[in-house]
């Protein structure tokens, strides 16, 4: 049913959801730390605007009663429980930020007439694809999977002249909320990914995974995974592995690559890590400040959120219109807007998009290199180094297929 | 002794595109930052394009989503590819090289400088 939302007459409210159940285990003072510094820094905006408003929050705490696994598996009715909350007390705010398990976005996005902004830090699964008055500031499994179809596509570079068509899928239902999401659509028999590779395979358990790595009889050299160098160690160990494996291992939200005394140890080898570039400004166009690499992580993105809904309210109010409108819910996409660490770009559905950066382990110097990044916002790969200095022999990626000649 | 010598400049219709090398020798390119520098006619120098030693490119706004840096240590190059030039692009390009303190970040400022290119977009 319609909520009245207090977003008028100068006063401009966010509802922010604070649920117990979330895609990251970040202690809520902290993220409810992030809104706030966001908060002053858009009134701090909004002031130089010449724009005389106030702008709050109310975060809106679940019960923890019922839904209390902590993670994203209860949180589909959770969601629908605070905004019965918020109905009832009538607090509905100009937009709302949170949730963040793709379970509880989808179930409110369908359950409920959204007048309103829905800003999420996370919602990674294909099923928040394309919804019409969702913003997700965070990287989207429908991104993960476009740079992937590219890469595996891609046989021009200097160290990757062959296409590939296949890979295994290790997923074992033990994955974080982003990985969960990730692998989920990348084993979905309708996704993208899945209709552009001939031969796709998902590992379920640990001895199928330690079985490829040096079966002659496998069908692809390529495996991909999700998580950290420490969750690849205990699965994969010190074993062996044919020199023409490549792992494809997915950690987008973790910059401890970007740490300078990082030496990658030596299971990360045969390893190509998939992450985020940890920044790509140059502020003031110039060189004079050092750029150290910022967190990107959930925190970050309520912050952001909260800049977000800033932007769309200034731009709103200097052009006299009216914040409770459907034009002001479907207006946070297709847009640029100042992020708390450089600009921030979302695509026509709202999706947040980012440089994504592949790295690889120098055979040289056991440290950590950048071989290419990738731009979401244009489906683009750039080569960065040409002649990398990889275990692989020649220096090049191997075929997918082992024994079959250039394609 | 550390030298660096850019070329590839020219005279280029808008929307064209260039590719800059910066040839190194003296030193390993894993060892230092590479920054992109250019100077137009009466204004200051501005950076461009960073890669810090771990190869991580930087942009400056104004270029980002046109201009691409790569490097090939086994030939001792770095390139700067230029896309969608437009007339504001006009200027001396340098490369500029720094003793990497950090891998991941660009250095505050440049010891050691090419002799530049120049780079003229118009029609």
């Known amino acids: 049913s319609q909520v009245s939302q207090n977003c008028h007459n100068g006063s401009y409210e966010i509802s922010v959801l604070m649920m117990g159940n979330s895609a990251f285990a970040e202690p809520l003072k902290n993220l409810e730390d992030a809104v706030n510094e966001g908060l002053e820094i858009v009134r701090g905006r909004l002031q130089n605007a010449g724009l005389n408003v106030t702008v709050n929050a109310t975060f809106m705490y679940s019960d923890g009663l019922i839904h209390n696994s902590g993670d994203c598996r209860s949180s589909t009715c959770e969601g629908l429980d605070l905004l019965r909350k918020i109905s009832n007390a009538q607090r509905m705010g100009c937009v709302l930020i949170g949730p963040s398990c793709t379970y509880s976005t989808f179930q409110m996005y369908l359950d409920t007439e959204l007048s309103y902004p829905m800003i999420s830090a996370g919602s990674f699964g294909l099923s928040c694809d394309y919804k019409e008055t969702l913003t997700r500031l965070m990287s989207p499994a429908r991104k993960l999977m476009y740079f992937l179809v590219n890469f595996w596509k891609t046989n021009d570079l200097p160290f990757k002249t062959y296409s590939w068509s296949t890979s295994y899928v290790y997923k074992n239902g033990t994955e974080t909320e982003d990985c969960f999401w990730y692998l989920n659509a990348l084993e979905a028999s309708v996704s993208y990914f899945s209709h552009e590779l001939g031969f796709k395979v998902v590992l379920r358990q640990d001895k199928e995974f330690q079985d490829i790595l040096m079966d002659h009889n496998r069908k692809s050299n390529v495996i991909i995974m999700c998580g950290g160098p420490e969750f690849l160690y205990k699965l994969k160990g010190d074993r062996a592995v044919a020199e023409d494996i490549v792992i494809i291992l997915v950690d987008l939200f973790n910059d401890q690559y970007f740490e300078d005394n990082v030496t990658a140890p030596d299971y990360m080898k045969n390893v190509l890590v998939l992450t985020l570039s940890p920044g790509n400004s140059l502020l003031n166009s110039s060189f004079s400040r050092n750029l150290s690499p910022t967190k990107r992580d959930f925190a970050l993105a309520y912050l952001n959120g909260i800049l977000l809904f800033g932007h769309m309210l200034k731009i709103f109010l200097e052009n006299g219109e009216n914040i409770t409108t459907p034009k002001f819910a479907h207006a946070f996409r297709n847009l640029t807007f100042e992020g708390y660490d450089g600009p921030v770009t979302l695509d026509d559905w709202g999706d947040v998009d980012s440089t994504m950066v592949l790295l690889y382990t120098s055979v040289d110097t056991k440290k950590y290199k950048v071989l290419l990044t990738y731009d979401t916002h244009v489906n683009k790969t750039y080569p960065v180094d040409m002649s990398p200095t990889f275990t692989w022999k020649n220096s090049k990626l191997p075929n997918d297929i082992t024994g079959r000649g250039p394609q | 002794q550390l030298q660096l010598v850019e070329s590839g400049g020219g005279l280029v219709q808008p929307g064209g595109s260039l590719r800059l090398s910066c040839v190194t020798s003296g030193f390993t390119l894993d060892d230092y930052a590479i920054g992109w520098f250019r100077q137009a006619p009466g204004k200051e120098r501005e950076g461009v394009i960073c890669?810090?030693?771990?190869?991580?490119?930087k942009y400056a706004d104004s270029v980002k989503g046109r201009f691409t840096i790569s490097r090939d240590n086994a030939k001792n190059t770095v390139y700067l590819r230029m896309d969608s030039l437009k007339p504001d692009d006009t200027a001396v390009y340098y490369c500029a090289a720094s003793g990497a303190t950090s891998r991941w970040n660009c250095p505050p400022q440049y010891d050691h400088w090419g002799q530049g290119t120049q780079v003229t977009v118009s029609s």
């Open positions: 890669l810090t030693s771990g190869g991580l490119p």
